[in-house]
Interface confidence: low
Amino acid sequence: GCLTQLYENAFFRGGDVASMYTPNAQYCQMRCTFHPRCLLFSFLPASSINDMEKRFGCFLKDSVTGTLPKVHRTGAVSGHSLKQCGHQISACHRDIYKGVDMRGVNFNVSKVSSVEECQKRCTSNIRCQFFSYATQTFHKAEYRNNCLLKYSPGGTPTAIKVLSNVESGFSLKPCALSEIGCHMNIFQHLAFSDVDVARVLTPDAFVCRTICTYHPNCLFFTFYTNVWKIESQRNVCLLKTSESGTPSSSTPQENTISGYSLLTCKRTLPEPCHSKIYPGVDFGGEELNVTFVKGVNVCQETCTKMIRCQFFTYSLLPEDCKEEKCKCFLRLSMDGSPTRIAYGTQGSSGYSLRLCNTGDNSVCTTKTSTRIVGGTNSSWGEWPWQVSLQVKLTAQRHLCGGSLIGHQWVLTAAHCFDGLPLQDVWRIYSGILNLSDITKDTPFSQIKEIIIHQNYKVSEGNHDIALIKLQAPLNYTEFQKPICLPSKGDTSTIYTNCWVTGWGFSKEKGEIQNILQKVNIPLVTNEECQKRYQDYKITQRMVCAGYKEGGKDACKGDSGGPLVCKHNGMWRLVGITSWGEGCARREQPGVYTKVAEYMDWILEKTQSSDGKAQMQSPA
């Protein structure tokens, strides 16, 4: 299953399959997730080791048992791959690293005014993988405001050095934010020239294209079909690159198919997995296990659940079957692709779905209506769980926020439905940033059921929580995916990085904002909060957040939206925007429904009809 916990001051011994430099443990974990053999990782921050060569070291590890012995190492961080973790699987990494220079091949330098502009340039350059930016206070004047675009053979820095007044980060192409655009065309009977960066076996050109998209240096590919004239080259997928970023030449060639990486697509990237099943095809590889199952789909499910399994073959040979069950061969290889592909067999083959975003584990549950003041504009995909709850009456207008917590579930505030309990007047917009982008053609979700907490009373602040079941499940994308829920009764975690988001008023007597706003707000103890609201009871099922001096807060229209906190690299839904005295007033924190206190209720209400929970708490 999905294991998200990180182990601090611990290092996994043995099992190494690869090593690289990464700026933090989260990026190391992402590289582990996308490595075909990696199940575990260990990361050495700069502060944890004196050996300059091992600083920022990211060590990817495999284990037949799924675990390795941990040794104590001060400062080290270890953890698990996020394979099987559904919506948490993403190659997108937005963080900017201050005081760090990520080294690589510098192929472009320009003067820019901010690190954000440098990151944008990298994202809009086809070859750029990461970048470094020298700030205005950099010690050498001639380098100030320099934006260095970089690449490396593996897509990760060749070294990482601590350097004052330098900021580094990665291209946001994996976040589907590139302005370049992409070529969806597949060119039949055409072979591309240029440099081969890798060679794998795939059953078709579409799998070849997805592998190219997630390979750090693949810009285009050529696939040789199973009827290609040279037998040893059949089903070969050649991943390619060039200096210019496009093929320098192409040759008409029977039984070849060529195309481009889809990494530069805007707004949608293909999932990093291959769900198609190939009848009459055998995939060869190292045997992991053989089990008897009923049907090829069950075989694929079995492979997906066995975390080390990469691909499978389901045999229908009479000697491989007994009664209704046949042998399911679970296999793996060094590069995650079959070592042999045979056609005209009595088998059916396919791949593990462990890297798909849309598994069943879709949710890790790891007095005046309020309202964001003092915030800034959000960017695409920054808060992909944020939804806009809108009412369609004479006109249509944003009314409340909400948080996507599953394919078919949204969590919001109960008071959003005061006087509006009819589900057919509501429209729920997900995967949006600008409200002005909504037109009559914008897809929206309709409500199947509104579940208001049984103890909620109109005009009271208590139990201000409601679940919305959508009429149809949503697919997950970089811009639309759920937020993890906290563990039941989560009281021990100290959250220091918390944000509130919404389209609400930017001042008490303001108006709804067009661009989703975000504001970083510290949590306030309930004791402190109670002092500020002596006329109200601040219960343990509430959480407060705000600055003593005011100036930053949720406001009207933010109600029901998320208060999220980042802990150990993972965002969790800590609160639901509920109420407050005015907006951003001095010594008047915002009051939020404490989600951890309602985990039993959420899990009970989201039970599916067959009794299986739609979400589970983090381990």
């Epitope: 009456l393 004479t394 006109a395 249509q396 207008r397 006087g419 002005s436 009559k440 108006e511 009207k556």
Partner: antibody
Framework: EVQLLESGGGLVQPGGSLRLSCAAS????????MTWVRQAPGKGLEWVSS????????IYADSVKGRFTISRDNSKNTLYLQMNSLRAEDTAVYYC?????????????WGQGTLVTVSS | DIQMTQSPSSLSASVGDRVTITCRAS??????LNWYQQKPGKAPKLLIY???SLQSGVPSRFSGSGSGTDFTLTISSLQPEDFATYYC?????????FGQGTKVEIK
Amino acid sequence: EVQLLESGGGLVQPGGSLRLSCAASGFTFSWYPMTWVRQAPGKGLEWVSSIGPSGGQTIYADSVKGRFTISRDNSKNTLYLQMNSLRAEDTAVYYCTTEYGDYGGGFDPWGQGTLVTVSS
Amino acid sequence: DIQMTQSPSSLSASVGDRVTITCRASQSISSYLNWYQQKPGKAPKLLIYAASSLQSGVPSRFSGSGSGTDFTLTISSLQPEDFATYYCQQSYSTPPTFGQGTKVEIK
């Protein structure tokens, strides 16, 4: 200050046409739905037509459907009502209004109105 | 369409009186009921929205109540500037519809 200012009213013969305009200021016009409401002399208020923020969604009262067209130019912060095939019963003061306040909170503010008289 | 019926259609009252106007919807409109005041030759002015919420800048002597089909506008102590015509309006469904109005005159 949020303001709406209608213009374009006047005397017109039955069967004739008229185009009313409503200039908006003091708020983000492109975000709000806009509405025309009319009031015949000595009578009550009657909703005429509404248009969505982007102009894509329009709705009309049965009494004007097929004859009146509501539109907006967000770049000019202006709302329009094109009135064709006018009848005597269309004689009224025409107000433009929006729902600038709280969600579902009724029509506010209103313009001062422009008088349309349909008479031969 | 939802019909809105106001009563009375007119009433006479004195300064300082408590005045109540009722509005009935032909079907349930939840709390989607708004009240307007209109003086001769002027545009309507929103007083109460969502049945009971006082519009910014409106004196607190005006109040609204009700939900479903029956609603009330109350002026707790009538002032000289309150003599006008009052309309209710539902914003629950399209088309929005108004009541026929209640004229409040000086006794």
